[in-house]
């Protein structure tokens, strides 16, 4: 009987752990290739998939191009942005490029915006080279409050690699705020 009770208690514990894990907020958003802005100026990327291919979201909200936090906590945020160009897709306007990504937090309660992470480089992409590629990966640990929004800005959006394994960002809650 004692063994049976221990087994029942154990399974309840597993279930409680599992349901807590399932409730942990996370998101992995991939670029929507059909709606990438053109040009070379810095823009906010507002069109992301949240429910197809590798993209998934749970206990977070995606709205108006922004990832919205629903639970206070410490989150790991990450972004991977790939830029590429092949001569068959056209010419480069300039061979000297600044290829950048900015991960930004916006607070609705106290209207303010902060760059949490940025990454990138200046590049020389010769017009005589058939193909160019450059990848940026940034990641960090941040305290986020419910209602805060995470968005992505990039330079040279017309050079973005539209594949789901190339251009994506996400977040997952690591622990509660004490």
């Amino acid at each position: 009987i004692r063994a049976e009770k221990a087994m029942v208690d154990g399974s309840w514990l597993d279930l409680a752990k599992r349901s807590k894990l399932e409730a942990q907020p996370f998101a992995h958003l991939t670029i929507n290739a059909t709606d990438i802005p053109s040009g070379s100026h810095k823009v906010s990327l507002s069109s992301w998939y949240h429910d197809r291919g590798w993209a998934k979201i749970s206990n977070m909200t995606f709205s108006n191009g922004k990832l919205i936090v629903n639970q206070d906590g410490f989150y790991y945020l990450y972004a991977n942005i790939c830029f590429r160009h092949h001569e068959t897709s056209g010419d480069l306007a300039t061979e000297y490029l600044q290829l950048m990504v900015y991960v930004t937090k916006t607070s609705i309660k106290i209207p303010s915006s902060h760059t949490l992470m940025k990454g990138g480089s200046t590049k020389y992409w010769s017009g005589n080279s058939e193909f160019h590629f450059y990848s940026i990966n940034v990641g960090g640990f941040f305290k986020l409050r419910s209602g805060e929004e995470i968005s992505i800005e990039v330079s040279n959006p017309s050079l973005l690699d539209p594949d789901q394994d190339a251009t994506y960002f996400g977040a997952f809650k690591v622990r509660d705020i004490d």
């Epitope: 053109s38 040009g39 070379s40 001569e87 068959t88 897709s89 056209g90 010419d91 306007a93 300039t94 010769s126 005589n128 080279s129 058939e130």
Partner: antibody, heavy 118, light 111 residues
């Protein structure tokens, strides 16, 4: 298919200016440099310069820097070349052109004949 | 500026014979493993037509009797068996470096 349609022949007086046009179709106008080439009667080809219609970046052969001005109207998918202070040396056929997907000038307009005469 | 010198300036070839045109650049037109030299045909009263791109690649729709070879500073356009419709002026052009430049042209006459 890619097409470049140029404006008609021009007859101009010495010292005057002319503005030639080149309407592009069959591709995204803002993603390729559009080039201009000069050919005097019975002579060879001379590269004048090029414009990137998106941001309007330009590049010129030194010889044509003060002679030609390249502009583009993105909404009309049309490139322009203005030639100023015309002399008899400017009498020529002017072509607009675009590279192929793998280099080399694969697409040419039909040419515009400019005649400078008093 | 890169100067392109074509030779000969004119050429007279019998039908069915081979025609060879040379283009020499004042400096190398090679970069990133490719030669940025192209060949054009121009018939009287017409716009030029691209025949060969990147030194040796046949442009779509161009007859296989046309071929290109060479690298760095020395390039050749060959017509293996000349036909009547090949009577025209031929130009080489480099786009390795701004400003792009053309050779002076070679006039091919059919005997």
């Amino acid at each position: 298919q890619v097409q470049l349609q140029q404006s008609g022949a021009e007859l101009a007086s010495p010292g005057a200016s002319v503005k030639l046009s080149c309407k592009a179709s069959g591709y995204t106008f803002t993603t390729y440099w559009l080039q201009w080439v000069k050919q005097r009667p019975g002579q060879g080809l001379e590269w004048i310069g090029a414009i990137y219609p998106g941001p309007g970046n330009t590049k010129y052969t030194q010889k044509f820097k003060d002679k030609a001005t390249l502009t583009a109207d993105k909404s009309a998918s049309t490139a322009y070349m203005q030639l100023n202070s015309l002399t008899s040396e400017d009498s020529a056929v002017y072509y607009c052109a675009r590279r192929g997907s793998r280099r080399g000038i694969a697409y040419w307009g039909q040419g515009t004949l400019v005649t400078v005469s008093a | 500026n890169i100067v392109l010198t074509q030779s000969p300036a004119s050429l007279s070839v019998s039908l069915g014979q081979r025609a060879t045109i040379s283009c020499r650049a004042s400096e190398s037109v090679d970069s990133y493993g490719r030669s940025f030299m192209h060949w054009y045909q121009q018939r009287p009263g017409q716009a030029p037509r691209l025949l060969i791109y990147l030194a040796s690649n046949l442009e779509s729709g161009v007859p296989a009797r046309f071929s290109g070879s060479g690298s760095r500073t020395d390039f050749t356009l060959t017509i293996s068996s000349v036909e009547a419709e090949d009577e025209a002026t031929y130009y080489c052009q480099q786009d390795n470096e701004d400003p792009y430049t053309f050779g002076g042209g070679t006039k091919l006459e059919i005997k």
